[in-house]
């Protein structure tokens, strides 16, 4: 706590600006003017504040808001949004798009702290889903967002989001993820071709059931190994040799530099040694 | 890993301008850091002279302020000091250095340092 | 400015033997910083926001303090210790470092 001093003579801020650098912290705190520094926090960033001196701005902002920052001040806070802890962050009604992009610029190129990660949840409850706009937000800064979630959280997702989701995105999902978004993907995706439909389902295929698979199997997909790889070890089992050779097509041959690992070994044992021995690959059911 | 340079000549004569380079690998300049420039003289006293922000702003110790310049590169990734009117005062190991937060507090990653000689 | 006057100057201890150094303030801080110097060497970062050790830094080191008062303390000495140790502030501008604790080995 910053203790209270009276301002010297002179001294009292007329404004935010580099002149405040110099200023002791009992200096900040006596002679700059709370309701000042929320009108003009979108100078704050500009200005070379030290890690203390940013203290000193927080606590004043602290007392004239005991209940939450309004909106107008949170997207302007820029670094002081660092100095915040989740709890300061919970008081807080973040609606605006823009509001979230500026903070998460703030902290770009760091890993998820707690404070961004309250932040997100505060504002995906506010909205009450994660929509399109949102999710292409959140996945921009942190491509490993959506696998951060819960498969609980991920239900309330909409289809019309999914399109947002690229690839990587989903490179940290674990299967009970993916049983929840999979779904979602082929509703989303359901009107599109064959081809254009494998581009876009296919890295959520970790979630697809076996009836989805054998159906695959019939369009000339041609699934690469690191996608068969990812399958649901359950799903796959069903599929017969000729359904899987289908399905991977060209890539066929890959199975036998995965012949010890899940779910091609457990596949393998599943099947007939005269129905593998027809791919020709030297597999031993 | 963050790795800092300095270069530039080890002898300068009084009256002139000592100009050093420092070279960053690891990081970029423009990230979010400041870029600093610190000098240790002979006898082991340490003096922040500047330092060059990342959006290429500045801010100088009030003793030097009318004698130094701090500029960058960013394509370079290099970060530059000018001290101009030099005199045997200015004789110092001269480091460069980047800040270990998002605000001005402490002085995470440093040079080995340069030493430059102020003498006729 | 802020000036730093550290204490004592120049010390020496056995290994073993816990050390510990000061760093007096003339105005009030939150936070200090610490760095270790051997000859020859770039300062190293030891311990930042007053008592967080630095990446790399061996755990018998430690920082404690607040207000004008702060000190460096190491629980054990070895060898490898002897160094100059400066403590810095950037509390306000221009950030100013300590002059120096040079702990000898005995």
């Known amino acids: 706590e910053v203790e209270k001093t009276a301002c010297p003579s002179g001294k009292k801020a007329p404004e935010i600006d580099e002149s405040l650098i110099f200023y002791k912290k009992w200096e900040l705190e006596a002679c700059v003017d709370a309701a000042l520094l929320a009108t003009q926090m979108d100078r704050v960033n500009a200005i070379p504040f030290t890690y203390e001196q940013l203290d000193v701005l927080k606590h004043k902002l602290d007392e004239l808001y005991p209940q939450g920052y309004p909106e107008s001040v949170i997207q302007h806070l820029g670094y002081l949004f660092l100095k915040m802890s989740p709890e300061d962050i919970r008081k807080w009604n973040v609606t605006s798009l823009e509001t979230l992009k500026a903070l998460l610029e703030v902290n770009k190129g760091h890993e998820m702290s707690p404070q961004v990660a309250t932040l997100i949840d505060r504002f995906v409850k506010g909205r009450g889903q994660l929509d399109k706009d949102t999710l292409d937000t959140l996945t921009a800064f942190y491509p490993g967002y959506l696998c951060s979630l819960s498969p609980e959280e991920l239900s309330s997702v909409p289809p019309s989001s999914i399109w947002a989701v690229r690839p990587q995105d989903l490179d940290t999902c674990d299967p009970r993820q993916l049983d929840v978004l999979y779904p979602k993907a082929r509703l989303a995706f359901q009107n599109m071709n064959g081809s254009e439909y494998f581009v876009k389902i296919q890295s959520f295929l970790g979630g697809a059931p076996t009836e989805d698979l054998k159906a695959l199997s019939q369009q000339n997909v041609s699934m690469d190994l690191a996608t068969f790889m990812k399958l649901r070890t359950d799903a796959v089992l069903p599929l017969t040799v000729a359904e899987v050779q289908k399905l991977l097509g060209p890539h066929v041959e890959g199975l036998k530099a995965e012949e010890r690992h899940r779910p091609v070994r457990d596949w393998i044992l599943r099947q007939r040694q005269d129905d593998l021995d027809t791919l020709g690959l030297g597999l031993q059911g | 890993d963050v790795q800092l340079q300095e270069s530039g000549p080890g002898l300068v004569k009084p009256s002139q301008s000592l100009s050093l380079t420092c070279s960053v690998t690891g990081d970029s300049i423009t990230s979010g850091y400041y870029w600093n420039w610190i000098r240790q003289f002979p006898g082991n006293k340490l003096e922040w002279m500047g330092f060059?922000?990342?959006?290429?702003?500045?801010n100088y110790n009030p003793s030097l302020k009318n004698r130094i310049s701090i500029t960058r590169d960013t394509s370079k990734n290099q970060f530059f000091l000018k001290l101009n009117s030099v005199t045997t005062e200015d004789t110092a190991t001269y480091y460069c250095?980047?800040?270990?937060?998002?605000?001005?507090?402490?002085?995470?990653?440093w040079g080995q340092g340069t030493l430059v000689t102020v003498s006729a | 400015q802020i000036v730093l006057t550290q204490s004592p100057a120049i010390m020496s201890a056995s290994p073993g033997e816990k050390v510990t150094m000061t760093c007096s303030a003339s105005?009030?801080?939150?936070?200090m910083y610490w760095y270790q110097q051997k000859p020859g060497s770039s300062p190293r970062l030891l311990i930042y926001?007053?008592?967080n050790l630095a990446s790399g830094v061996p755990v018998r080191f430690s920082g404690s303090g607040s207000g004008t008062s702060y000190s460096l303390t190491i629980s054990r000495m070895e060898a490898e210790d002897a160094a100059t140790y400066y403590c810095q502030q950037w509390s306000s501008y221009p950030p100013t470092f300590g002059g120096g604790t040079k702990l000898e080995i005995k």
């Open positions: 105005s009030s801080l939150s936070y």
């Open positions: 250095a980047r800040e270990g937060s998002y605000a001005p507090a402490w002085f995470a990653y």
């Open positions: 926001d007053t008592s």
């Open positions: 060059i922000r990342f959006d290429g702003t500045n």
